[in-house]
């Protein structure tokens, strides 16, 4: 004989459990229906009547099947340094994430509690590790043969152009300046003395970290004063 289908509320088998989307009500000692997302339990079940559900009010929500007496309040409106990536609905909480150029310095279960502006690397320093949603930019001094002449949270150190004839040698914060004879590097139309990577990917993606120390690991020519340790602005 097929097992008889039980309708809520019903008493579970001794030692048994309630089915999916049901809960055991201690007072009624019965298996009762949960309320779906977007609703809450308006009236709890009894031995003879099932749970009565009702829709969440404005600015409140339930995300899961539940038997809570009241819906949860949606979080406060997003701050000026945030963007609302998920609106408050009856079924989900508002989610605030940091706007471009910012990262989450203090996260919460969903979204971000506190955003902070991404560090900008000053001239002579480039991005060693780009910022993510939850981590700040890491700057590094531009290693020999490379430079950055910008204050930026995205620009990496780029190699100096190689000249037929050098007018001014490059340094960590300035590209080499070539004389009127064309430099030995492909130039983009209209570009002046900027290195053009062969690879089609953006110059700002996956910057590779420079070696932390040069002695013993270069094919490098010794010249000039030691680099400063820090390379960011506004810290």
């Amino acid at each position: 004989l097929p097992a008889q289908v039980a309708f809520t509320p019903y008493a579970p088998e001794p030692g048994g459990t309630c089915r999916l989307r049901e809960y055991y009500d201690q007072t009624a000692q019965m298996c009762c229906s949960k309320c779906p997302p977007g609703q809450h339990a308006k009236v709890f079940c009894t031995k003879t009547s099932d749970t009565v559900c009702d829709s969440c009010e404005d600015s409140t929500y339930t995300q899961l099947w539940n038997w809570v007496p009241e819906c949860l309040s949606c979080g406060s409106r997003c701050s000026s340094d945030q963007v609302e990536t998920q609106a408050c609905t009856r079924e989900q909480n508002r989610i605030c994430t940091c706007r471009p150029g910012w990262y989450c310095a203090l996260s919460k279960q969903e979204g971000c509690r506190l955003c902070a502006q991404l560090r900008k690397c000053r001239p002579g320093f480039g991005v060693a590790r780009p910022g993510t949603e939850t981590s700040d930019v890491v700057c590094k001094p531009c290693a020999p043969g490379t430079f950055s002449n910008t204050t930026s949270s995205t620009d990496i150190c780029r190699p100096h152009q190689i000249c037929h004839v050098v007018a001014i040698p490059g340094n960590a914060s300035m590209d080499a300046v070539c004389t009127s004879t064309s430099p030995t590097r492909s130039m983009a139309p209209g570009a002046v003395h900027l290195p053009q990577p062969v690879s089609t990917r953006s110059q700002h993606t996956q910057p590779t970290p420079a070696p932390s120390t040069a002695p013993g690991t270069s094919f490098l020519l010794p010249v000039g004063p030691s680099p400063p340790a820090e390379g960011s602005t506004g810290d």
């Epitope: 590779t208 070696p211 010249v223």
Partner: antibody, heavy 127, light 109 residues
Framework: QSLEESGGGLVKPEGSLTLTCAVS?????????ICWARQAPGKGLEWIAC????????AYYASWAKGRLSISKASSTTVTLQMTSLTAADTATYFC????????????????????WGPGTLVTVSS | IEMTQTPSSVSAAVGGTVTINCQSS??????LAWYQQKPGQPPKLLIY???YLTSGVPSRFSGSRSGTEFTLTISDLECDDAATYYC????????????FGGGTEVVVK
Amino acid sequence: QSLEESGGGLVKPEGSLTLTCAVSGFDLNSYYWICWARQAPGKGLEWIACIDGGSTGSAYYASWAKGRLSISKASSTTVTLQMTSLTAADTATYFCARVQSYVGYANYGYPNYFNLWGPGTLVTVSS
Amino acid sequence: IEMTQTPSSVSAAVGGTVTINCQSSEDIDSYLAWYQQKPGQPPKLLIYHASYLTSGVPSRFSGSRSGTEFTLTISDLECDDAATYYCQSAYYSSSADNTFGGGTEVVVK
């Protein structure tokens, strides 16, 4: 701008030879370093040494070349490579090449991208 | 620093693509150059800092880096590309007796 090597030729084992690299079209100044490399017949390239084109006279060598080969700036237009105790293994075409300099850090330097080369001079060590 | 270049020789038809690899024994960041050498001539600098093309070099040549592995790719192969190609670590160290790779001969059919 160009580089030209001279001084190659036939030399006996244990003999000595001085190669010269003459630059033209640019000045030997702190904007450039001059380096030597060599290539044995049918073989690959081997770096030897580099010297600052400016007034510092700073030079550095491949470990195998230290003591037996000596690079120096002879004038504002020439760099020499003195070679002693030559053996058959030193038989090769010797190239001088130019590296662009960099205003930078004492504990760093400049990457050696050889963007200008001379045609080379052949050194044959044989009895 | 040792530079291990593979393969030692490669053959491809006109219009084809050739890939040459170079492995560095140490982390050299992006300090790597690629040279082209034809018989009886000095080497010619093609690419520096792993992926930057020097002027006059066709964009059919490209370079890339992944950690200590570097790649030179020649696409739309032409007869004039027949040569030996060398990678070079642009880092100096006292242990670097040869900063060049062993070379790869490219034969164009």
